[in-house]
Interface confidence: low
Amino acid sequence: SSSDTCGPCEPASCPPLPPLGCLLGETRDACGCCPMCARGEGEPCGGGGAGRGYCAPGMECVKSRKRRKGKAGAAAGGPGVSGVCVCKSRYPVCGSDGTTYPSGCQLRAASQRAESRGEKAITQVSKGTCEQGPSIVTPPKDIWNVTGAQVYLSCEVIGIPTPVLIWNKVKRGHYGVQRTELLPGDRDNLAIQTRGGPEKHEVTGWVLVSPLSKEDAGEYECHASNSQGQASASAKITVVDALHEIPVKKGEGAEL
């Protein structure tokens, strides 16, 4: 019943499907008679003999230039020409498992495999590749203020996996050598706050200093890291004696 010239449909003579059914769903043969398993990405389709088959949803059968070795089939262009199933959308996508898949079809196939193993289904989180090193979305800004004031530095970072954000105070020693001190340390007038967002895989952190003292002056570094890399940005806190010493850029006020 699966020959290229269709005779009467005789379901009894159809080859059996696997006893557990088809991983990517069922289709019918060229004659619309026998049930067959839909083919996955990279699998043979459209040919004669073992190569005959139809692609799963979201895929199309693209004829290959040269026939697969050992496959029956007519001359090039004929009904027996074999092809392979390829994804209609051929851009990489990021799965909810944190893996980048070359196509949405491969993600769907991975999801079905996961579900068949009793794991959670994998969904598409975004188009494009998945894991990326941290980058600074909004760096901290330099601050000038008087002793006793309440000031804060903020830093917004993004990365996949979501980065870990820490703050350091950069101390410059002799000959330009620098070392960092992890904040908050044992300083009572300083607090660190971190929260997720505003976007997915983003983290925003703050250093709050209150009251500001001369010892708090210096360079503060926001440092983000994940499995893919690290990024940092810094800003200076300058402590002045009086408000009139704070330089005001045109159109800007001091951050109080």
């Epitope: 696997p18 699998e43 088959g53 068949s116």
Partner: antibody
Framework: QVQLVQSGGGLVQPGRSLRLSCAAS????????MHWVRQAPGKGLEWVSG????????GYADSVKGRFTISRDNAKNSLYLQMNSLRAEDTALYYC??????????????WGQGTTVTVSS | QSVLTQPPSVSGAPGQRVTISCTGS?????????VHWYQQLPGTAPKLLIY???NRPSGVPDRFSGSKSGTSASLAIAGLQAEDEADYYC??????????FGGGTKVTVL
């Protein structure tokens, strides 16, 4: 109906090699992943190796990694297991088995009759 | 020693109900991986009996049933028959070892 006919087993000395074959029929061989599972005398089942429909994905149990090589010839509907540096503990009945999918779910719906490998000096 | 633990043997009279347990850990059954069961009649190759914890392939009698809870799974045979005398193996996946089988349970019909 689905048939998996195995050959290549036998008695071999430690350190020597052996190649097992599994001839498949009754299903579209190049649609499915295939596996080797072994059973030592009087013992339970142990998965040895698996290969996806297009040989793009291959896996081995730690106990055979680096010594055994799985391969397939879709044109000949055949599965192979090349076993090198054989040890006494490799003595077992080796089964070839068909997966339910093209990728390696390791859910085995059809099994061969088994072929015996005895490693002894 | 097998990663999945099964009792070495269970027995029952014809018509009785027997249960075989398969105990794993948080890295296999407890991690959410499916459990499959195989039946091996004396002198024959294993045969798939239950897949995906509780599903029966066509041709498997409905007296065989499977279930899973937490880090363990079980196979029940209701109305034990003489032809059920065989070895039964559970199989799952392990995040470190990939494919894992239980040690097997011999079912004897008294």
């Amino acid at each position: 109906q689905v048939q998996l006919v195995q050959s290549g087993g036998g008695l071999v000395q430690p350190g020597r090699s052996l190649r097992l074959s599994c001839a498949a029929s009754g299903f579209t061989f190049d649609d499915y992943a295939m596996h080797w599972v072994r059973q030592a005398p009087g013992k339970g089942l142990e998965w040895v190796s698996g290969i996806s429909w297009n040989s793009g994905s291959i896996g081995y149990a730690d106990s055979v990694k680096g010594r055994f090589t799985i391969s397939r010839d879709n044109a000949k509907n055949s599965l192979y297991l090349q076993m090198n540096s054989l040890r006494a503990e490799d003595t077992a009945l080796y089964y070839c088995a068909k997966d339910i999918s093209g990728s390696q779910l390791v859910l085995l719906d059809y099994w061969g009759q088994g072929t015996t490998v005895t490693v002894s000096s | 020693q097998s990663v999945l633990t099964q009792p070495p043997s269970v027995s029952g009279a014809p018509g009785q109900r027997v249960t075989i347990s398969c105990t794993g850990s948080s890295s296999n059954i407890g991690a959410g991986y499916d459990v499959h069961w195989y039946q091996q009649l004396p002198g024959t190759a294993p045969k798939l009996l239950i897949y995906g914890n509780s599903n029966r392939p066509s041709g498997v009698p409905d007296r065989f049933s499977g279930s899973k809870s937490g880090t363990s799974a079980s196979l029940a045979i209701a109305g034990l028959q003489a032809e059920d005398e065989a070895d039964y193996y559970c199989q799952s996946y392990d995040s470190s070892l990939s494919v894992v089988f239980g040690g097997g349970t011999k079912v004897t019909v008294l």
